[in-house]
């Protein structure tokens, strides 16, 4: 039961995370004009990964796409790439995890296959979340660098009669959405991996070989990878004797105790 809950929750958390990554990638507010002491501005600039926008106090908003690939900074291209990779991996992970969910029955798919799919989707979510966090962090670092550079420029070359209003940019809402979404996707991925570990012992059990001691008709199950190292006896960590003579087929048909932890 706990495995199903962990898997389901991991799926939902990752779904929210990936939706957030998509939202962040599409948002225009990756960087917003720093208003420092003036909360009201006649012209407000903000930029996204795909276009830059200007909102006038008149309410008029104009956005212009970046219609060049070669003319864009390499860092911006890298951030775009990281976010897209994150979305693609996350989307594939979601697709895989749907079929891996314990609560969904698809034909005669074995739990071992579901465990593998759960682990695969979990890893995909982890990588997806890391890509998003990396992308947002790279952009944030770029902003911080540019912010201090433009701040330095504001206080140099002021000797002349004409001053240039230097537009400084600070963190936009998309950065925070991206960080949170990346984190959620990462957490969801970890939960999927934990759920996989809960599923996996049973798979090894099902493939166990029955050892028949002389004069007894008792089946012994060697401990799974979760409970033991796989070497020697396993009396300390896991009860391996079921207390009744059952065949492998019978053992397989009973519900796993891991479902009710």
């Amino acid at each position: 039961m706990a495995v199903t809950a962990c898997q389901g929750l991991g799926f939902v958390v990752s779904l929210i995370g990936i939706a957030g990554i998509i939202a962040a990638t599409c948002m225009d507010q990756w960087s917003t004009q720093d208003l420092y002491n003036n909360p009201v501005t006649a012209v407000f600039n903000y930029q996204g990964l795909w276009r830059s926008c200007v909102r006038e106090s008149s309410g008029f908003t104009e956005c212009r796409g970046y219609f060049t690939l070669l003319g864009l900074p390499a860092m911006l291209q890298a951030v775009r790439a990281l976010m897209i990779v994150g979305i693609v991996l996350g989307a594939i992970g979601l697709l895989v995890s749907i079929f891996a969910l314990k609560c969904i029955r698809i034909g005669s798919m074995e739990d071992s296959a579901k465990a593998n799919m759960t682990l695969t989707s979990g890893i995909m979510f982890i990588v997806s979340g890391l890509c998003a966090i990396a992308g947002v962090s790279v952009f944030a670092n770029m902003l911080v660098t540019n912010f201090w550079m433009s701040t330095a420029n504001m206080y140099t070359g002021m000797g002349g009669m004409v001053q240039t209003v230097q537009t400084r940019y600070t963190f936009g809402a998309a950065l925070f959405v991206g960080w949170v979404a990346g984190g959620l996707t990462l957490i969801g991925g970890v939960m999927m991996c934990i759920a996989c570990r809960g599923l996996a012992p049973e798979e090894t059990n099902y493939k166990a070989v029955s050892y028949h001691a002389s004069g007894h008709s008792v089946a012994y199950k060697p401990g799974g990878f979760k409970a033991s190292t796989g070497f020697g006896s396993n009396t300390k960590n896991k009860k391996i004797y079921d207390g009744g003579a059952r065949t492998e087929d019978e053992v397989q048909s009973y519900p796993s105790k891991h479902d009710y932890v």
């Epitope: 501005t41 200007v54 240039t164």
Partner: antibody
Framework: EVQLVQSGAEVKKPGASVKVSCKAS????????MHWVRQAPGQRLEWIGM????????NYNEKFKGKATLTLDKSASTAYMELSSLRSEDTAVYYC???????????WGQGTTVTVSS | DIVLTQSPDSLAVSLGERATINCKSS????????????LTWYQQKPGQPPKLLIY???TRESGVPDRFSGSGSGTDFTLTISSLQAEDVAVYYC?????????FGQGTKLEIK
Amino acid sequence: EVQLVQSGAEVKKPGASVKVSCKASGYTFTSYWMHWVRQAPGQRLEWIGMIHPNSGSTNYNEKFKGKATLTLDKSASTAYMELSSLRSEDTAVYYCARLKTGNSFDYWGQGTTVTVSS
Amino acid sequence: DIVLTQSPDSLAVSLGERATINCKSSQSLLNSGNQKNYLTWYQQKPGQPPKLLIYWASTRESGVPDRFSGSGSGTDFTLTISSLQAEDVAVYYCQNAYTYPFTFGQGTKLEIK
């Protein structure tokens, strides 16, 4: 047709207060910032401040903080500017104006002359 | 605050001739975000409120005759009337529309020679 109709001329004594009105018609009142500008005799135009009829938020020129107070009556599509502690230097024509694209004023009231004289 | 200085203070031009009014800003009015210059030109006739002629330094307001044109970028701007008409006699103002507080030039009085 967009129209901004202001209240009539006022003559006030120094230290008194005056409230000028600006009634808007022909457009959605709550969609545009309303600005106030003054023109003293022989002086350049001076921006006083602005108010958004939807949110009621205001922004003033530092020079007019404490001097001008902008309010509105949404139901009557009317903006008001109250000038307090009047002095002879406040003698001017006061305009309300609607802000449009390019942060420019496309429609202006006809102007209200405020004369401060003892 | 941004200071706008117009030149000349007054200008006399013959009918049908070109009239040029300059406006210089103490700070750049060019917005890097959209590469637009936030300078506006107004015409004011005696006893009337100002009338919008040009915004974004060069965009003519609808209904304004095409003999009026605006140019310039950054800190230096020009209003040109290609062929002066009698009805163009007025005072012309430039306005900073880039930062608050909005500021205006001192005005240029245009007369017929």
